[in-house]
Amino acid sequence: IWELKKDVYVVELDWYPDAPGEMVVLTCDTPEEDGITWTLDQSSEVLGSGKTLTIQVKEFGDAGQYTCHKGGEVLSHSLLLLHKKEDGIWSTDILKDQKEPKNKTFLRCEAKNYSGRFTCWWLTTISTDLTFSVKSSRGSSDPQGVTCGAATLSAERVRGDNKEYEYSVECQEDSACPAAEESLPIEVMVDAVHKLKYENYTSSFFIRDIIKPDPPKNLQLKPLKNSRQVEVSWEYPDTWSTPHSYFSLTFCVQVQGKSKREKKDRVFTDKTSATVICRKNASISVRAQDRYYSSSWSEWASVPCS
Amino acid sequence: RNLPVATPDPGMFPCLHHSQNLLRAVSNMLQKARQTLEFYPCTSEEIDHEDITKDKTSTVEACLPLELTKNESCLNSRETSFITNGSCLASRKTSFMMALCLSSIYEDLKMYQVEFKTMNAKLLMDPKRQIFLDQNMLAVIDELMQALNFNSETVPQKSSLEEPDFYKTKIKLCILLHAFRIRAVTIDRVMSYLNAS
């Protein structure tokens, strides 16, 4: 058993049918010695008397808010949560496996630049009685500071019969140098509590590996005289790290016909312009990627050919 | 990216071309190592990230773009020597390009070259003959060093008398390639910045 926060405790259970469970001793936080009784949740049934209460915690029915009283007055509370270990592996019931970029990916994180700011998100089908708390650091043995905000519900989607809820959090490394070469990964730890179930999820990454630039901005077309060709131009996104000559991007320019089946013409360039043939009803799209470290491509910025 | 690429002209700055070749070569070598050594811990998540140049060179600090010198987090160990030389520098480009930066890059390359050559000698003794260092990568390191044209004492190749542990050598190769790739990215960024200055 360990303390998650004041008066909230997590009991770790080896979870299998007929498991013996864990013996837990609760102590009433009071100078009083006599006349103390214990109850669980809203029930008025007295579970025991005395300054300490010993319970065998086996199932969720044994978890909840234990309260010690004296003469009708509440002295203190202890909330017991359960953390299930199933065959040596901690349970992952609360969050959905996003399966991207690989199986067992519960937390996904992205950064728009090298400033040390990043966003993580996760999915669940649970709509109520759910709380998250997020901590982060650079490295784990001698952790350096990363400050995270509160997790918020960022999207709701309908997936078949189920509703899916997306939560996200923004974090900022306290003293980040965009040019630094990372040798210790960022660690992100999410505590999830659903009713009386506790779970924790972690992700470890280097900012360089989660970079995904915003799409190029100000995408414009300039027709070339007496030609089907156009000059496409664009700019670096505002959110990208500066100076751009140091934090350079490379670009992919795509000409896509109206039909998805039509052949796509693609050109790669390090410049912020390109000359392409603009077909009728086609659209031109441009996306960006770090020129020197191949992390994710940005989403496409698009303009119609007409 | 085996599709049409519009490549910029390296122009006045010969080192840019060499540094791009270096990054390509080390990335290819790392990919080859990951595939060949699939049963070894060779991915970025599995290895310890060690920097053999730590406390010996200060490339990131010495080559920091001027725009980032206002960022206190980038200045923890910044040295401020602005003397310029080295053949990559056109004499009129002196604002950011300090000798310290380019000589630091040269020292990095020299240290990695020695490590890679020592390692290759060990790998050649492996009866499995599983992996060797790409000669192209070693050649590209050499070319960039020559383009930088710094005179420095030659470091003797380390020789080891004890029987090599090939498992450890292959893991060390992965560690070295990951670190060298990160340094090659920094070098490329620096050269691109210098080229634009």
Partner: antibody, heavy 115, light 112 residues
Framework: QVQLVQSGGGVVQPGRSLRLSCAAS????????MHWVRQAPGKGLEWVAF????????YYADSVKGRFTISRDNSKNTLYLQMKSLRAEDTAVYYC????????WGQGTMVTVSS | SYVLTQPPSVSGTPGQRVTISCSGG????????VKWYQQLPGTAPKLLIY???QRPSGVPDRFSGSKSGTSASLAITGVQAEDEADYYC????????????FGTGTKVTVLG
């Protein structure tokens, strides 16, 4: 004590269907994940499928994906395996089993796919 | 499709020490717990070892399990005639958990 009693096995022709049941008693069935494991005659153990305690997630071996469906009725304390488009290579003893460090197995039920 | 490899058979005389190996990789045994089962002819498998080296109550202490790196092993010290059976190791793969990964199985024969 924990008990898993299996039923539903038998002889079936290729291409036909069969449903296996596993009745649980002696524990809170709705709190635990459950597996199906099979063993072809003279061969080793092969995992078939898994279902979460609440039925929210199901996992299948590639060899049965799209043909077999694992399900559970927590009100009846029963686990099921619906097998469709049966093949000769599905011939095996099928076991249900609880998920956890200490597990309990059913007695096994024989499924023979033969024309 | 078996990823965990066991020797097909091992044998020993009563009283001898018999060991069975189970070889896997970094994504299964290397990062997940290992179990061992004993299966007597015509019966369901019986759990002998869980969590690499833990013995459930009721399992004789001549059975012991261990794990090192990407391999695990089961030792029977002082093998007895009633130990003649098939033995299977089991683990998970970190990418496909909770799918069970079973070893190829080992037939233990007690001679004499």
């Amino acid at each position: 004590q924990v008990q898993l009693v299996q039923s539903g096995g038998g002889v079936v022709q290729p291409g036909r269907s069969l449903r296996l049941s596993c009745a649980a008693s002696g524990f809170t069935f709705s709190s635990y994940g459950m597996h199906w494991v099979r063993q072809a005659p003279g061969k080793g153990l092969e995992w078939v499928a898994f279902i979460r305690y609440d039925g929210s997630n199901k996992y299948y071996a590639d060899s049965v994906k799209g043909r077999f469906t694992i399900s559970r009725d927590n009100s009846k304390n029963t686990l099921y395996l619906q097998m469709k488009s049966l093949r000769a290579e599905d011939t095996a003893v099928y076991y249900c089993k609880t998920h956890g460090s200490h597990d309990n197995w059913g007695q096994g039920t024989m499924v023979t796919v033969s024309s | 499709s078996y990823v965990l490899t066991q020797p097909p058979s091992v044998s020993g005389t009563p009283g001898q020490r018999v060991t069975i190996s189970c070889s896997g990789g970094r994504s299964n045994i290397g990062s997940n717990p290992v179990k061992w089962y004993q299966q007597l002819p015509g019966t369901a498998p019986k759990l002998l070892i869980y969590g690499n080296d833990q013995r459930p109550s009721g399992v004789p202490d001549r059975f012991s399990g261990s794990k090192s790196g990407t391999s695990a092993s089961l030792a029977i010290t002082g093998v007895q005639a009633e130990d003649e059976a098939d033995y299977y190791c089991q683990s998970y793969d970190r990418g496909t958990h909770p799918a069970l990964l079973f070893g190829t199985g080992t037939k233990v024969t007690v001679l004499g």
